[in-house]
């Protein structure tokens, strides 16, 4: 059946549309296109005679139509009036007619909208605000966005006027946000610039800080007042009801008992016209001076500088005390006190020496503490760490690397790829990576204060396919019943399954075997000699499955209790004594002999020719394994009889 397909169906003004003909019959004489749903000579657009390949414009031809030999009609530079139905009239060679109708709709390209507001500075809990999306456009849909999110459900939010108007009733400070409107029709969508709602609120009840109300004579009084307010509040201070100053902070140096009293902070919002006050009562006590700490070096460098901390003021016949981390001084060769205990010297500071440090002056009744002092020890950078630890990434994912090096002041970071500088940031982000992003990724950490730099290099491979894995071990020669061994399957890759086999079999169930790190690490706790087997790991991802070469665990064990052979203990005089000692051990043990406690030779076999009764005694074999650090021994008694006295005794060998 002859059909017309409009491509596209919804057309933007100024664009073009193709009326595509399907199932055009064969053996045609010609065809004509008409505007509308029927054949009407007054509304003919164009006709086409196949024999002459001649196209003839009709009354409705606008100059923007092109007819193709396959009968399809292209209309260019579309205008609103073009909306509607189009009819194709086909005349076959047998002069039988066939018709088909198609249609399309024309929509304007929307302009960028803007937001108008009926209230630019609404007051919290009082005003409403109506945002209107301009301009008003026919056949357009209106949408609203708050902080780039769709509108939350709230009884205070109301859409009206075909969603063109957004009203916020009873605004609150939380309504301070970015508002955008969007207009949509079937051919376009446009979003406005954001409008920030500026809600006037406050002041809330002010907060006076610090909270402490007790001070010593001679201290500075520094009170700060803050009240949440928009626009920011104007502050006034009153002491015992008397106006002092219009500032946010009240500072009175070197206070005395006379400064005790009630301190009032008043916050005023000129736009809302509201005032709020808070009162605090300050008490000043008369006491001896509070000690304080001075330092000869405020920014010492780790492992380089010494720091001398002195407790001030210097007072005769006074006992000085020191605390580090709220504890009394630890015993350390790097901590030295002067004769009067007033100066504490830290030799060759480390990053762990930051403190806090406090000194105290002891008087008759109590101990006065100084304020704590924290040392700013400059150190690092240490070797940077690049995370995550993956070395393999699949194409198409995002690569996000972060670098961190312990450093004070914090390190400045640079990234290089294959030696070429990329950027001076702590994080490196590359989206949608390909195999061309494989390479050497270097993070350089620099400490501007010390001038020191350290680098770490990581090889990144971008490949869907994983390489043949390998096994790394944290202990190549574990000791039996003592050590644990952690095997790790390399490389570490995203979206990868890790598997393990022992002697070609899947892992046995054992409380001494533990998988961790996404099955990438196999840990054997308390290894035994029976664990000396072939371990293989496998990796699998979307396109690969691969096994490592086997790694055989070399478990060090022994020496076990040795065995002396032959087992005979009685010999005839004149026989040869040939004793052999053996102990299960890895590596092979060192052997030594003692006869009646006297060291003999360091051999596995002890040979004595033509023994006599003088050779009676205790024969001890000692075994030692230098690798395990373990020793063992066994003692055997040998009796030698004069020949002929004891028949049936061994003649030796």
């Amino acid at each position: 059946k002859l059909t017309i397909e409009s491509t596209p169906f919804n057309v933007a003004e100024g664009k073009e549309v193709l009326l595509l003909v399907h199932n055009l019959p064969q053996h045609l004489f010609g065809y004509s296109w008409y505007k509308g749903e029927r054949v009407d000579g007054n509304r003919q657009i164009i006709g086409y005679v196949i024999g002459t390949q001649q196209a003839t414009p009709g009354p409705a031809y606008s100059g923007r139509e092109i007819i193709y030999p396959n009968a399809s009609l292209l209309i260019q530079n579309i205008i609103q009036n073009d909306t509607g139905f189009y009819t194709l009239h086909v005349i076959k060679s047998d002069l039988v007619n066939e018709e088909a109708t198609g249609q399309f709709r024309v929509y304007p390209e929307l302009p960028k909208p803007s937001i108008s507001s009926n209230n630019s500075k609404p007051v919290e809990d009082k005003d409403a605000v109506a945002f209107t999306c301009e301009p008003e456009t026919q056949d357009a849909t209106y949408l609203w966005w708050v902080n780039n999110q769709s509108l939350p459900v709230s009884p205070r939010l109301q859409l009206s006027n075909g969603n063109r108007t957004l009203t916020l009733f009873n605004v609150t400070r939380n309504d301070t946000a970015s508002y955008k409107c969007e207009t949509q029709n079937p051919v376009s969508a446009r979003r406005s610039d954001s409008v920030i709602l500026n809600v006037l609120y406050g002041p809330d009840a002010p907060t006076i800080s610090p909270l402490n109300t007790s001070y010593r004579s001679g201290e500075n009084l520094n009170l700060s007042c803050h009240a949440a307010s928009n626009p920011p509040a104007q502050y006034s201070w009153f002491v015992n009801g008397t106006f002092q100053q219009s500032t946010q902070e009240l500072f009175i140096p070197n206070i005395t008992v006379n400064n005790s009293g009630s301190y009032t902070c008043q916050a005023h919002n000129s736009d809302t016209g509201l005032n709020r006050t808070t009162v605090t009562t300050i008490t000043v006590y008369a006491e001896p001076p509070k000690p304080f700490i001075t330092s000869n070096n405020s920014n010492p460098v780790e492992d380089e500088d010494a720091v001398a901390l002195t407790c001030e003021p210097e007072i005769q016949n006074t006992t000085y005390l020191w605390w580090v981390n709220n504890q009394s001084l630890p015993v350390s060769p790097r901590l030295q006190l002067s004769n009067d205990n007033r100066t504490l010297t830290l030799l060759s500071v480390t990053r762990n020496d930051v403190g806090p440090y406090e000194c105290g002056i002891q008087n008759e009744l109590s101990v006065d503490h100084s304020d704590p002092v924290i040392l700013n020890v400059l150190y690092g950078p240490d070797d940077p760490t690049i995370s995550p630890s993956y070395t393999y990434y699949r194409p198409g994912v995002n690569l996000s690397l972060s670098c961190h090096a312990a450093s004070n002041p914090p390190a400045q970071y640079s990234w290089l790829i294959d030696g070429n500088i990329q950027q001076h940031t702590q994080e490196l982000f590359i989206s949608n990576i390909t195999e061309k992003n494989s390479g050497l990724y270097t993070c350089q950490a620099n400490n501007s204060a010390s001038g020191h730099s350290r680098t770490t290099v990581k090889t990144i491979t971008v490949s869907a396919e994983l390489p043949k894995p390998s096994i790394s071990s944290n202990n190549s020669k574990p000791v039996e019943d003592k050590d644990a061994v952690a095997f790790t399957c390399e490389p570490e890759a995203q979206n990868t399954t890790y598997l393990w086999w022992v002697n070609g079999q899947s892992l046995p169930v054992s409380p001494r075997l533990q998988l961790s790190n996404g099955n990438r690490t196999l840990t054997l706790f308390n290894v035994t000699r029976n664990d000396a087997r072939a371990y293989v790991c496998g990796i699998q991802n979307s396109v690969s499955a691969n096994r490592s070469d086997p790694v055989t665990l070399d478990v060090l064990y022994g020496p076990d209790t040795p065995i002396i052979s032959p087992p005979d203990s009685s010999y005839l005089s004149g026989a040869n004594l040939n004793l052999s000692c053996h102990s299960a051990s890895n590596p092979s043990p060192q052997y030594s002999w003692r006869i009646n406690g006297i060291p003999q030779q360091h051999t596995q076999v002890l040979f004595i020719a033509k023994i006599t009764p003088n050779n009676n005694g205790t024969y001890a074999c000692f075994v030692s394994n230098l690798a395990t650090g373990r020793n063992n021994s066994i003692v055997k008694s040998i009796t030698v009889s004069a020949s002929g006295t004891s028949p049936g005794l061994s003649a030796g060998a």
């Epitope: 194409p395 396919e465 598997l499």
Partner: antibody
Amino acid sequence: EVQLQQSGPGLVRPSQTLSLTCTASGFNIKDNYMHWVRQPPGRGLEWIAWIDPENGDTEYAPKFRGRATMLADSSKNQASLRLSSVTAADTAVYYCHVLIYAGYLAMDYWGQGTLVTVSS
Amino acid sequence: DIQMTQSPSSLSASVGDRVTITCSASSSVTYMHWYQQKPGKAPKLWIYSTSNLASGVPSRFSGSGSGTDYTFTISSLQPEDIATYYCQQRSTYPLTFGQGTKLEIK
């Protein structure tokens, strides 16, 4: 025994959507990636896509992106392929395929193949 | 996309002959994999990760190569080896196959 059994119509009309299902037995599809590969008559092999049934992650060949959809139903141990707006050029034998560890060995399994003809 | 060029596209050899098929990738790949396909059957993985024989594959088959150039070899052709062989790369998406080499007996 590991098996992949394919099902789906052998004839699809142009512009329609081709739908094929691959039912696995002998292993759990959640633990493996399922692939689809096709082979037009007398031609070579062409990879379409894979899916990770555990989380629904997919990767498509650019040529099929936007037209192919891979889905998995772990409860039925099934993976499926939908290819929309087909034309005669989509006539091919379609295979589902999985690469798994069977014991100690990495094994490659394929469905029996489904010849899909696109014709009106 | 990585293009895979297999040569020859077909070859005729006698039983006992040494047969070599080459596969060239347009960019460097990690490994090459080879499939055997007999008429009307699904492909079978024959050699994986360049040189490893899949389960049940006779030792007369071997694979080698690196980077962009890879080789598939049958040391002594047997009648049951008659099939079409495809190379495949899995290093980057989309995964791509060679156009195939059809092996026939003279």
